[in-house]
Interface confidence: medium
């Protein structure tokens, strides 16, 4: 076996190495002793865009001429690891994720450009890149240190309909307020003009051409 403990037998995983606090160091120090370990590099931190999109590069040092590669993105939050997405591709071809996958990606040599979409604040976590060289034998496995993806939910934009309602309400309020103000002012003004008399509005004949329809009322005091 060219790579002790990292060879796949039939469908069963014949696996040989476990990972925890210091174990990453254990991997890096001891795997080379009994296996040409495949190193996987990925950025330490990535900030998702306001639209919930995060992109990072996963680069692996291929020990051989692999033709079939499988890339898996694992998310670790708290203590639990879950598979986010996975794609198998033939060297030189595009990565094909499932239709409903939140991941997309492109490959270029030993580099895979991964994009994860639809992220929310609750999706913040460590995203680990796992690369498997499936064919030809021997089978190789490499696991990156993980990329901490931070997702900050944008301030929610108010609904445009809601904004229109607010605008309409404010406009109506201002209109009625100005109407009321005008009425009050006018009544005060009238009271000042003739404190002891009453009066009527009389429609006078037009002074300008009929077509303009501008009727101007005059105040005629009645004794």
């Amino acid at each position: 076996m060219a790579c002790l403990g990292f060879q796949r037998h039939k469908a069963q995983l014949n696996l040989a190495t476990r990972t925890w606090p210091c174990t990453l160091l254990f991997f890096l120090l001891f795997i080379p002793v009994f296996c040409k370990a495949m190193h996987v590099a990925q950025p330490a931190v990535v900030l998702a865009s306001s639209r919930g999109i995060a992109s990072f590069v996963c680069e692996y040092a291929s020990p051989g001429k692999a033709t079939e590669v499988r890339v898996t993105v694992l998310r670790q939050a708290d203590s639990q690891v879950t598979e986010v997405c996975a794609a198998t591709y033939m060297m030189g071809n595009e990565l094909t994720f499932l239709d409903d996958s939140i991941c997309t990606g492109t490959s270029s040599g030993n580099q895979v450009n991964l994009t994860i979409q639809g992220l929310r604040a609750m999706d913040t976590g460590l995203y680990i890149c796992k690369v498997e060289l499936m064919y030809p034998p021997p089978y190789y496995l490499g696991i990156g240190n993980g990329t901490q993806i931070y997702v900050i939910d944008p301030e929610p934009c108010p609904d445009s309909d809601f904004l229109l309602w607010i605008l309409a309400a404010v406009s109506s309020g201002l209109f009625f307020y100005s109407f009321l103000l005008t009425a009050v002012s006018l009544s005060k003004m009238l009271k000042k003009r003739s404190p002891l008399t009453t009066g009527v509005y009389v429609k006078m004949p037009p002074t300008e051409p009929e077509c303009e329809k501008q009727f101007q009322p005059y105040f005629i005091p009645i004794n």
Partner: antibody, heavy 124, light 107 residues
Framework: QMQLVQSGAEVKKPGASVKVSCKAS????????ISWVRQAPGQGLEWMGG????????NYAQKFQGRVTITADESTSTAYMELSSLRSEDTAVYYC?????????????????WGQGTMVTVSS | DIVMTQSPSTLSASVGDRVTITCRAS??????LAWYQQKPGKAPQLLIY???NLQSGVPSRFSGSGSVTEFSLTISSLLPEDFATYYC?????????FGQGTKVEIK
């Protein structure tokens, strides 16, 4: 709450191999590490190795390197521990235990859930 | 490998006693230490993780302290069900190693 159920007791002859299974139920099996710990009669606890099914990786204590193989079958949520070239001193109770650990940060809670144990007797 | 040494090996105590078990690591393990309780014929049960954190469901009479190489487990007031064997375990560096155990027996 996850539970770990192990296979029954085994009696083996020196030089033979034994394969003990550990089936998980009530939890996400592949997301956690499963370790194997043994305890010889009247003795203390000894860690043999462990596996993280979703990572597809495991490691072994140097003492057992080359004699132990730990595998996992995600489809049946079962972990296996195979010990070969058995000797009389391998007579022990073999436990599988769930570990909660963090790949990068070191947040970790040791072995929080254990199987009931499998007695393996090596005798000629 | 990191060697874990527990003391005492056996401890005789009475119900209601305050009991302390110590565990020493052969090199620094920071706070990566767990304590387990094991009763005859049963699997161990996690009591304390990361030196001083009480595992969910474990009574508050159990407490852990210490760091670097010196650690201790204290049972504030022994109950009849606390008579068992206690193990410490480091998980700072693989392989994970256990202490040889401390048997708490009835005086």
């Amino acid at each position: 709450q996850m539970q770990l159920v192990q296979s029954g007791a085994e009696v083996k002859k020196p030089g033979a191999s034994v394969k003990v299974s550990c089936k998980a139920s009530g939890g996400t099996f592949s997301s956690y590490a499963i370790s194997w710990v043994r305890q010889a009669p009247g003795q203390g606890l000894e860690w043999m190795g462990g596996i993280i099914p979703i990572f597809g990786t495991a490691n072994y204590a140097q003492k057992f390197q080359g004699r132990v193989t730990i595998t996992a079958d995600e489809s049946t949520s079962t972990a296996y521990m195979e010990l070969s070239s058995l000797r009389s001193e391998d007579t022990a109770v073999y436990y599988c235990a769930r570990e909660i650990g963090s790949y990068s940060s070191g947040w970790y809670r040791a072995f929080d859930i254990w199987g009931q144990g499998t007695m393996v007797t090596v005798s000629s | 490998d990191i060697v874990m040494t527990q003391s005492p090996s056996t401890l005789s105590a009475s119900v209601g006693d305050r009991v302390t078990i110590t565990c020493r690591a052969s090199q620094s393990i920071s706070s990566w230490l767990a304590w387990y309780q094991q009763k005859p014929g049963k699997a161990p049960q996690l009591l304390i993780y990361k030196a001083s954190n009480l595992q969910s469901g474990v009574p508050s009479r159990f407490s852990g302290s210490g760091s670097v190489t010196e650690f201790s487990l204290t049972i504030s007031s022994l109950l009849p069900e606390d008579f068992a064997t206690y193990y410490c375990q480091q998980y700072s560096r693989p392989p994970w190693t256990f202490g040889q155990g401390t048997k708490v027996e009835i005086k």
